[in-house]
Every structure is written in C-alpha cells, then in structure tokens.
C-alpha cells in the first residue's frame, strides 16, 4: 500500500502545532476496534507528524490507521481534511517500476514491509544514499527518479525524496531497497529490527 501512510502523513503535516496536540489527546481516548492497543501516552505526546504517522501505521496498519486518523480529524471538526485523507487512501496506485514483474492487477497490500515500518528512521539515519541509488538504478528507479534524489542537498532530504516514489512500488521493489540497505548499512537494519 504505502499510499495510506503518505495520506496520513500529509494530513498530519497540514495540522497546526495546536491541532496536532489536540489530535494526540483525542487519540488517547478515541474508541478502538477490538484487538487493537493504544499508543502509550508518554511516547505519543512527544512525537512530530512523521513519527506519529509511523506509530499509527505500526500500531494499526495502514488501512485502519487511515480510518482512525480520519475519525479523529472528523471529531476535531476537520471534516474536509478527513474526507481528503479517505479519498487519497482509496485512489488507484501508479505504474509498476522498471525491472520488476508487475502483478496482473494492482492489489492493496494488507501488511507492512520492513521499509514501510521504519520509514522515519531510515529517512533520519541512512547515510550511504548514493550507494543505494546505484544499487536501485534501472531495477527500481528510473533515470529521472535517480537524478531527482541525487539533486537533494542532504541525506535526509534524499531519503525523503526516495520514499516519495515508494507508494508505486510493489513488495519486490521494496525488497531490493532492503537488500541494498543490508549490504551498505547492515548495523542500521539490525538496530531497526531489534526496535
């Protein structure tokens, strides 16, 4: 999927600091579906929009995470933003990237790839971005995408740009990125896995 995660992030990044604080407080008391736990208060209150998106998706997965986010936004009186979030979640996905067998028809993935689970940490902590780009070039990244990532000034902005392409990626594309990470920054993958 990936699309729902990005839609949640877009919505949360469009909240003011005061609205984000209110969102977190409402999240502490919003009714949850049976079988789902609540994000601990201590961790929740200190999070920025990116970390909160990752926490929502890791706790509730993408589909329910987006639904829950929309419910809280509605409860805050932000009906339009909630509607945009749900509309974005249900849009069709883009074309399959170069070099990987595309499925006969695109289907929403119910689960989260390691790459999706740890998006925020990868954006913050990957340093060997050029190596990743070379490993992915022609397999997952087009020339245009490769150049766009390289043009970014810092490693986090490079990674953020790289992640802007992942909603169109299938599972095997994400595996190729993960393989490149295992080869270039194995300690980081190990560390994230333990977390």
């Amino acid at each position: 999927m990936g699309r729902a995660r990005d839609a949640i992030l877009d919505a949360l990044e469009n909240l003011t600091a005061e609205e984000l604080k209110k969102f977190k407080l409402k999240l502490l008391s919003v009714p949850l579906r049976e079988g789902y736990g609540r994000i601990p208060r201590g961790a929740l209150l200190s999070m920025d929009a990116l970390d909160l998106t990752d926490k929502l998706v890791s706790f509730y997965l993408e589909t329910y995470g987006a639904e829950l986010t929309a419910n809280v936004l509605r409860d805050m009186g932000l009906q339009e933003m909630a509607g945009q979030l749900q509309a974005a979640t249900h849009q069709g996905s883009g074309a399959a990237p170069a070099g990987i067998q595309a499925p006969p028809q695109s289907a929403a993935k119910p689960g989260l790839h390691f790459i999706d689970q740890h998006r925020a940490a990868l954006i913050a902590r990957v340093t060997n971005v050029e190596w990743l780009l070379d490993a992915l070039y022609g397999k997952v990244l087009t020339d245009e995408q490769y150049q766009a990532v390289r043009a970014e000034p810092t490693n986090p902005s490079k990674m953020r740009k790289l992640f802007s392409f992942t909603p169109a990626w299938n599972w095997t594309c994400k595996d190729l990125l993960l393989q490149a990470l295992r080869e270039s920054q194995s300690y980081l993958v190990e560390d994230l896995e333990r977390s």
Epitope: I100, P103, A107, G111, L112, F114, N170, T172, L176
Partner: antibody, heavy 122, light 107 residues
C-alpha cells in the same frame, strides 16, 4: 497452525512444463511471501524465487529466469510454481516454504510443504 | 551470487559428543545466516536464524555464532535424533543461497 500442502508427484517429458501447487492455511495468505526451493536427488537446496500474494509481485533466481513462473490465487490461498522447458536435471523435490515472517529484514524458512517430486524422463 | 561453503562434508561422532559445523561465505553477509536440519524424506527444519537466534521449539543444545564470513553451528551434546544433514542459508542478498550441507553421522 500454519500448513502448506503441496500437489502430488509428477512425471514429465523433456521439453514439457510442470505446475506444482501449494495450498496455505492457518494464516492470512496475502500477508506473507511464499518461496520455492528445490532439491535434486542427493543434492543440496536451491532457492528458485518467491511471490508476495498481497500484490502479486514475484522475484526469481536469475538461473531460472524465463523458465519459472510463480503465481498465487488469493481466492483459494494457493501458490503455484510452473517450470517450463524441462530437462533431466530438473528432476528434484520441489518445496514451497513460508518465512518466519515477511515483515522482518530477511527471509528464514520456518514453514515448509511436504515436497513434490518431479521426475523428468523420456 | 554469494557462495556458502560448509565443512566438513561429513562429520562422524557419537551420541553425547559435541558437534561443530562450519559455514564460510564468499563475501561479507554480516549476521544474515540461518541453519536447517534435514532428515531423509523430510523437508528442512529451521534451527537458527540471524546467526545466533534459536527458533521456537528447538532444543537449547543447538547454538549458532559468527558474523561476516565465518559461522558455526554447535550441538553441545549429541542426541540420537540429531544425526541428519545440516544446511546453512544466507539472507543477505538475492538469490538466496544454501551451503552444500554437512552430513552428521553416527560413529
């Protein structure tokens, strides 16, 4: 509990194709990758590729690229491995396998089918 | 592709003895290695993953160690049911590859 049940033994002529099935149960089929590993008589294990039923994407060992096709039918929770242009050296036991979990940073195979013997002989 | 070389090809020991099996990778695979046990007519069985993690239900006499290119599977005190073929597998890069196996036989 997780179970992978494979189709029965096959005898095939050189040049023909074989399609082996693997029916999964005990977990959400679309949440985990299914891999295919083969073992020639008295030999070691060889990874052929995998499919992620959640989106239908597949990855193959380049050694088999063009000859192997892995597919999945979500409605029956069944994965398939088709190998074409068979030759005698394709005689082997073919296993489907599921990782411990697919969301980790690796694939270790905790669950295996019982194996399907494919014999290629003229 | 990454080549895994197991040694020895055959290991002859008695029940109660300690077994040490080795797996050497042709390039650095960090800790991304697992071990399997296979008995005749059966599918492989996962013992150890990520070099040293014991899989659920596997007896504590099995242990794994190593990182980089050299790995070891140790069986502290052999039981009669441990005599089988053991394979290592790397999970670092595609294609995933296995070692050629070590046959552990009764002396």
């Amino acid at each position: 509990q997780v179970q992978l049940v494979q189709s029965g033994a096959e005898v095939k002529k050189p040049g023909s194709s074989v399609k082996v099935s693997c029916k999964a149960s005990g977990y959400t089929f679309t949440d985990q990758t299914i891999h295919w590993v083969r073992q020639a008589p008295g030999q070691g294990l060889e990874w052929m590729g995998y499919i992620y039923p959640g989106d239908g994407s597949a990855m193959y060992n380049e050694k088999f690229q063009g000859r192997v096709t892995i597919t999945a039918d979500k409605s029956t929770s069944t994965a398939y491995m088709e190998l074409s242009s068979l030759r005698s050296e394709d005689t082997a036991v073919y296993y489907c396998a599921r990782p411990l979990y697919s969301y980790a940073s690796y694939y270790w195979f905790a669950y295996w089918g019982q194996g399907t013997l494919v014999t290629v002989s003229s | 592709e990454i080549v895994l070389t197991q040694s020895p090809a055959t290991l002859s020991l008695s029940p109660g003895e300690r077994a040490t099996l080795s797996c050497h990778a042709s390039q650095n695979i960090n800790v991304w290695l697992s071990w399997y046990q296979q008995k005749p007519g059966q599918a492989p069985r996962l013992l150890i993953y990520k070099s040293s993690n014991l899989h659920t239900g596997i007896p504590a006499r099995f242990s794994g160690s190593g990182s980089g290119t050299d790995f070891t599977l140790t069986i502290s005190s052999l039981e009669p049911e441990d005599f089988a073929v053991y394979y290592c597998q790397q999970g670092q890069s595609y294609p995933l590859t296995f070692g050629q196996g070590t046959k552990l036989e009764i002396k």
